[in-house]
Structures are given as structure tokens and as C-alpha cells.
């Protein structure tokens, strides 16, 4: 805590300007009026205050707004934002997308690198959380903004949080935004994507839905296999194993089209490995790829899960 001392004669700040960078901490405390600082917050960003000087400025704002800063101040915090703790930010009510963008831009400046950071800093995560909760749902404009700054943002949300994403927002999602999503997250996102893209024709639909297919059930994969989609192996390898297992050899062949030859290179990896174990060797042989491990001729396949359900 900075001691309260009288401001020396002639040093009282009439505006937030560059002369203040030559003030000692105690002079800033004594000579800068908090209300003046709040109204001229946008100037701070262009003046290279030291870390210690910014402590004093933050302290002044904290005293002026003990219940949390108003949005008019928050929007102009500039690099002072990076001194805020998650506890500070939880007191804020941020409703403007412009404010969110301004602060994400500041943080991006701090973390500039060839790739945008995959996961936000704690104070940024708190800011986003406050913003989304204030809006009630992750609408398209917000999602557009967040994924532009953090391509991995969607995949940092829990399945429960993802359930608040309306299908209309799915249009803002790019394939790279889903790179780090796990199956549980895709299980939530896939039905929303299916709904969002339902009015598109076959080939266009597949282009849009492709990156969400890690959440697709068997019946949807069967339907896609009838549409000459030529799914690539990378997409196939991300499908749910339980959704792939019931597919027949003919269905997989139709689903992959010319990419079916890639199965050979993946025969030891899931879901291909588990799928091979469920197919008749005769059927696998029709692919002419030399896939081994299928069920030999003459063997009876018992579906034990069905048997358990009946007993």
C-alpha cells in the first residue's frame, strides 16, 4: 500500500499525459485524481508507465470502483488489463463485444507468436466466461471473435458449456477450431452442426459437416456412405469406434471411395483395427488390400451385447 502524502506544489495532474512517467510512485498516488484517470484511461496505453507505476494507477481505480470497474473504463484499460486478476474481473459486467475485442487484442499483443495461443491466460478465460454468461449463450458473433483469437477455444469448453452453443453459431466454426476437441465434445457439437447444415445439398453438406463427424452415430455414417462423399482417412480415423464397428465392408468402401486404399496403412490403429476384427475375412478380401484379421469363413458371429439385452 502506498502511503498518503500531499502532492508537491505544481505537480497536480491536470491530464493523463507523458509527464507522469517521470513521477515517483508516491507522486502518482498523491497527484493523480482517480476520476481523471478513469475518464482518460485510453491515454495510459500509449504512455510507457513502469510496472510499479501501473500498480499505483490500478490501486486508484480499485479505490474509485470497489464493486468493479464500469465498462467505459474496462474498454480502455489497454495493457493495464494484464495486471488484473481473475478476482478483479469477476466483479465486471462486460456486455459489449467491442470491449471484449479490445481486451483480447491487448492480450494477443502480449502473447504474439506465429500461432495464436491455444488456451487463454486465466484473466482472459475469466473475462470470456463473464462475457458469455452475461449474454446467456455463445452466439455467432461472440464465437467468431473468440475463435479468431483462440482457434482452440471451443475445445477448451466442457460438454456442458458447449450445450449452450446455438446451432446457428456453428456456421462460425472452422475446421481448425475443432483440432483439439475430444469425442465427448464432438458428441455435443455434431447434432448442432447437423441441424445447422441440414438444408445444404450433399457435397456442400459433407464439406461443412466433415470436421464434426467425430460425434456422428452409425446411422449417419451409413447415410453418408450412400452419397459418394469420398471421406479422407484422416477424417475416418477420428470417427467414434462404436459408430464405425457396425459398418459393413461395402459401406466403408462407399464411404471412403478412392481413399479406401489407405485402410492398409492404418490396419493396426483404431478404429480400423477394431473394425477389421468384426468383418468376415471373405468380405475384407473383396477390397484387395491384403487386410488380415477378419473372422474366418464358417465361424458364427455372436453379438454378445444383444444376448445380454435379451437375458
Amino acid at each position: 500500500e502506498v502511503e498518503k502524502t500531499a502532492c508537491p506544489s505544481g505537480k497536480k495532474a491536470r491530464e493523463i499525459d507523458e509527464s507522469l512517467i517521470f513521477y515517483k510512485k508516491w507522486e502518482l498516488e498523491a497527484c493523480v485524481d482517480a476520476a481523471l484517470l478513469a475518464t482518460q484511461m485510453d491515454r495510459v496505453n500509449a504512455i510507457p508507465f513502469t510496472y510499479e507505476q501501473l500498480d499505483v494507477l490500478k490501486h486508484k481505480l480499485d479505490e474509485l470502483y470497489p464493486q468493479g470497474y464500469p465498462e467505459s473504463v474496462i474498454q480502455h484499460l489497454g495493457y493495464l488489463f494484464l495486471k488484473m486478476s481473475p478476482e478483479d474481473i469477476r466483479k465486471w459486467n462486460v456486455t459489449s463485444l467491442e470491449t471484449l475485442k479490445a481486451l483480447l487484442e491487448v492480450n494477443k499483443g502480449h502473447e504474439m507468436s506465429p500461432q495464436a495461443p491455444r488456451r487463454p491466460l486465466p484473466q482472459v478465460a475469466t473475462l470470456i466466461d463473464r462475457f458469455v454468461k452475461g449474454r446467456g449463450q455463445l452466439d455467432k458473433d461472440t464465437l467468431d471473435t473468440l475463435t479468431a483469437f483462440y482457434p482452440g477455444y471451443l475445445c477448451s469448453l466442457s460438454p456442458e458449456e458447449l450445450s449452450s452453443v446455438p446451432p446457428s453459431s456453428i456456421w462460425a466454426v472452422r475446421p481448425q477450431d475443432l483440432d483439439t476437441c475430444d469425442p465427448r465434445q464432438l458428441d455435443v457439437l455434431y447434432p448442432k452442426a447437423r441441424l445447422a447444415f441440414q438444408n445444404m445439398n450433399g457435397s456442400e453438406y459433407f464439406v461443412k459437416i466433415q470436421s464434426f463427424l467425430g460425434g456422428a452415430p452409425t446411422e449417419d455414417l451409413k447415410a453418408l456412405s450412400q452419397q459418394n462423399v469420398s471421406m479422407d482417412l484422416a477424417t475416418f480415423m477420428k470417427l467414434r469406434t462404436d459408430a464405425v464397428l457396425p459398418l459393413t465392408v461395402a459401406e466403408v468402401q462407399k464411404l471412403l471411395g478412392p481413399h479406401v486404399e489407405g485402410l492398409k496403412a492404418e490396419e493396426r490403429h483404431r478404429p480400423v483395427r477394431d473394425w477389421i476384427l468384426r468383418q468376415r475375412q471373405d468380405d475384407l478380401d473383396t477390397l484387395g488390400l491384403g487386410l488380415q484379421g477378419g473372422i474366418p469363413n464358417g465361424y458364427l458371429v455372436l453379438d454378445l451385447s444383444m444376448q445380454e439385452a435379451l437375458s
Epitope: P48, F49, Y79, L82, K83, G109
Partner: nanobody
Framework: EVQLVESGGGVVQPGRSLRLSCAAS????????MHWVRQAPGKGLEWIGS???????YYNPSLKSRVSVSRDNAKNTLYLQMDSLRAEDTAMYYC??????????????WGQGTLVTVSS
């Protein structure tokens, strides 16, 4: 990747003027305040001035009467105009972006600098 490239330095006679440029790339230049900083031989860094994204400028009071900072956001370029040059203005001039993390504040991105020598 962030890049700041200064140009325009050289040998100048006392009393003359000079305009330095700084070409920026790899970030949203128009969103950030940018700064000019200099370092004379054997001395520490001296902040010259800065310009906000909207064009508002701030200057070191000791240099205010002789320097002018401007920017062209369309060209991603920052400028420094220096008038009435003196021998003590001899220095390496850098354009930089200032920023803070949760533990410190500093000029976090710099150019390689351009040398200005004031000599007759």
C-alpha cells in the same frame, strides 16, 4: 512473426532534419500504440515519444519541441521526424511496441535499429 524494420538513418549535419521510418508486419499494427526509443553510445535507453492507434501523440518533454511521431496505418508504417539535430542526438533509434505481462512491463517488440550520426 512480428517484425519491425527501421530505416532512414545515416550521417546528418547539425541543424538539419531527418525522417526515420519503421515498417511493421506480423501483427495488427493499427490496433497498437507504437513508440520510438533511442540509445546513445554508452548510455541507457531514452524514450522519445509514442503515437496511439488513433493518431494522438505523446513526447518526452525534453525532446517535445524537436520531434514529431506519425503513422500510416494503411501502410503499417511508423515515422519519426527530427528537427534541429545536435551532436547529442547521435544514437541508435528503435521503433518498439510496449506491453505488460502479469509480472512486468517492457518494450516487448523491437526493430534492429537505425543509426543516426550527427556530425559536421
Amino acid at each position: 512473426e512480428v517484425q519491425l524494420v527501421e530505416s532512414g538513418g545515416g550521417v546528418v549535419q547539425p541543424g538539419r532534419s531527418l525522417r526515420l521510418s519503421c515498417a511493421a508486419s506480423g501483427f495488427t499494427f493499427s490496433s497498437y500504440a507504437m513508440h520510438w526509443v533511442r540509445q546513445a553510445p554508452g548510455k541507457g535507453l531514452e524514450w522519445i515519444g509514442s503515437i496511439r492507434h488513433d493518431g494522438n501523440t505523446y513526447y518526452n518533454p525534453s525532446l517535445k519541441s524537436r520531434v514529431s511521431v506519425s503513422r500510416d496505418n494503411a501502410k503499417n508504417t511508423l515515422y519519426l521526424q527530427m528537427d534541429s539535430l545536435r551532436a547529442e542526438d547521435t544514437a541508435m533509434y528503435y521503433c518498439a511496441k510496449y506491453g505488460c505481462s502479469s509480472i512486468s512491463c517492457s518494450f516487448d517488440y523491437w526493430g534492429q535499429g537505425t543509426l543516426v550520426t550527427v556530425s559536421s
